[in-house]
């Protein structure tokens, strides 16, 4: 998977008046990394692992970047003409990626009241707008404003892209990100399904990086995809991930089934418990 940096900024308006302040979150490799603390007006690391990425360096640069971006977005919201009474939001999501082959990708997306209305592929300078008339109107509105603003030229977008990549590379220099390996906790549970059947679920949690193989085996052979149900691999809020896989088996055949896990070049197999629950730490 590519390394990525994702900025998520939101500004609000009430009865046509743009509110001061903004909401901002930054994700590094899909994990919550920074957020903007509105009380302290500072960028704050999200959790211990984020603090470890920069070590003892300050977050002044991040604070400056987010503040500037927030200000830009507030100005953009002020130029959206169709603001009705009540609460409205403008959200900008910017992502830059570095792939294994060192190629880079960068994109920008705008949402009004949670609805996507404008996207840009920064490399190709291609803008895309959804079909809906509301999206078309909003997009025209915002693009006209961005064109008027001398700052928002092609050069500006490429600079923004370059800044994002520069920051990402800076974070990746930290061994915390590149060499971080947290083995999963694997836990197998069983629950009664229909008569004569049980559902067995294998959960892997607190692992990093995100890539993992989790599959049920019968007699040592992987079950086919259509007989297993997989959960998404999701952040668990601690800078690590979690996922699960489940299958239905005949009661009395538990001994034939094992959950196979592979992560960061290590693997383990986990039997179905005879009782209700069995928790196993993968000791590498």
């Amino acid at each position: 998977e590519p390394h990525s940096l994702r900025y998520n900024l939101t500004v609000l308006s009430w009865d046509g008046s743009v509110q001061s302040g903004f909401l901002a979150e930054v994700h590094l490799d899909g994990q919550p990394f920074l957020r903007y603390d509105r009380q302290k007006c500072r960028a704050k690391p999200q959790g211990q692992w984020a603090e470890d990425v920069l070590g003892n360096k300050t977050w002044d640069r991040e604070t400056r970047d987010l503040t500037g971006n927030g200000k830009d977005l507030r100005m953009t919201l002020a130029h959206i003409k169709d603001q009705k009474e009540g609460l409205h939001s403008l959200q900008e999501i910017r992502v830059c990626e570095i792939h294994e082959d060192n190629s880079t990708r960068s994109s920008q997306h705008f949402y009004y009241d949670g609805e996507l209305f404008l996207s840009q592929n920064v490399e190709t300078e291609e803008w895309t707008v959804p079909q809906s008339s509301r999206a078309q109107t909003l997009a025209m509105n915002v693009r006209n404003f961005l064109k008027e603003d001398a700052m928002k030229t092609k050069t500006h977008y490429h600079a923004m892209h370059a800044d994002c990549l520069q920051e990402l590379r800076r974070y990746l220099e930290s061994s915390v990100v590149l060499r971080r390996r947290v083995p999963p906790m694997v836990n197998v549970t069983r629950s009664e399904a229909s008569e004569g059947n049980i559902t067995v679920t294998c959960r892997a949690s607190s692992f990093y990086p995100r890539n993992i193989t989790l599959t049920w085996r019968q007699d040592g052979v992987s079950l086919s995809h259509d007989t297993q149900q997989w959960g998404d691999v999701l952040p668990d809020g601690n800078g690590t991930y979690q996922t699960w896989v489940a299958t239905r088996i005949c009661q009395g055949e538990e001994q034939r089934f094992t959950c196979y896990m592979e992560h960061s070049g290590n693997h383990s197999t986990h039997p179905v418990p005879s009782g209700k629950v069995l928790v196993l730490q993968s000791h590498w």
Epitope: D219, G220, V221, S222, Q255, T258, S268, T269, H270
Partner: antibody, heavy 118, light 107 residues
Framework: QVQLQQSGPELVKPGASVKVSCKAS????????IYWVKQSHGKSLEWIGY????????VYNQKFKGKATLTVDKSSSTAYMHLNSLTSEDSAVYYC???????????WGQGTLVTVSA | DIQMTQTTSSLSASLGDRVTISCRAS??????LNWYQQKPDGTVKLLIY???RLHSGVPSRFSGSGSGTDYSLTISNLEQEDIATYFC?????????FGSGTKLEIK
């Protein structure tokens, strides 16, 4: 490539026991089960049981429970089958096999001939 | 236990022939049927798994088919190196069981 190297032929007396070994190479030993199969002279094949080398979990054919004991030594990537209280009925070629995770008995050892004779 | 029956214990065919070996299970095995080749020196190799999936490195002249209780292995163009005994095996239910084998000879 995957290879399973079995120990040499054994000539044993009735009532004695024997330990057949199967050394795996060419893959991560603890990733895949090791299966054991018996072939009596001129006859078909019979599945004895299997072992998960990662945690030592075993599943046996009821017919061979009490006759065969499966173990592994992870440090040497070797699986063992111990056969006890041998009789002439136990004279056979014994094979170990492993899987690629997609099919049973994907790769086989060359077989070990066990002869039980007074 | 599930019985696997290979009614033909030996079969004679000429090089280049199309040869079919059949195997019947005593109950439905849901396509969990594998075919193995045992050479005269005792070497055993997997040919086909899950009824029709060709194991890597096995020549495409080998194919498998069937469902329920009836299965077959076909060699489309018999070659000298195919002289061996062929066993079917079910992997649906424990204990795993094998057919008695079909010995293939050259006419």
């Amino acid at each position: 490539q995957v290879q399973l190297q079995q120990s040499g032929p054994e000539l044993v007396k009735p009532g004695a026991s024997v330990k057949v070994s199967c050394k795996a190479s060419g893959y991560a030993f603890t990733k895949y089960n090791i299966y054991w199969v018996k072939q009596s002279h001129g006859k078909s094949l019979e599945w004895i049981g299997y072992i998960d080398p990662y945690n030592g979990g075993t599943v046996y054919n009821q017919k061979f429970k009490g006759k065969a004991t499966l173990t592994v030594d992870k440090s040497s990537s070797t699986a063992y089958m111990h056969l006890n209280s041998l009789t002439s009925e136990d004279s056979a070629v014994y094979y170990c096999a492993t899987t690629d995770g997609y099919s049973l008995f994907t790769y086989w050892g060359q077989g070990t001939l066990v002869t039980v004779s007074a | 236990d599930i019985q696997m029956t290979q009614t033909t214990s030996s079969l004679s065919a000429s090089l280049g022939d199309r040869v079919t070996i059949s195997c019947r299970a005593s109950q439905d095995i849901s396509n969990y049927l594998n075919w193995y080749q045992q050479k005269p020196d005792g070497t055993v190799k997997l040919l086909i798994y899950y009824t029709s999936r060709l194991h890597s490195g096995v020549p495409s002249r080998f194919s498998g088919s069937g469902s329920g209780t009836d299965y077959s292995l076909t060699i489309s163009n018999l070659e000298q190196e195919d002289i061996a005994t062929y066993f079917c095996q079910q992997g649906n239910t424990l204990p795993f069981t094998f057919g008695s084998g079909t010995k293939l000879e050259i006419k």
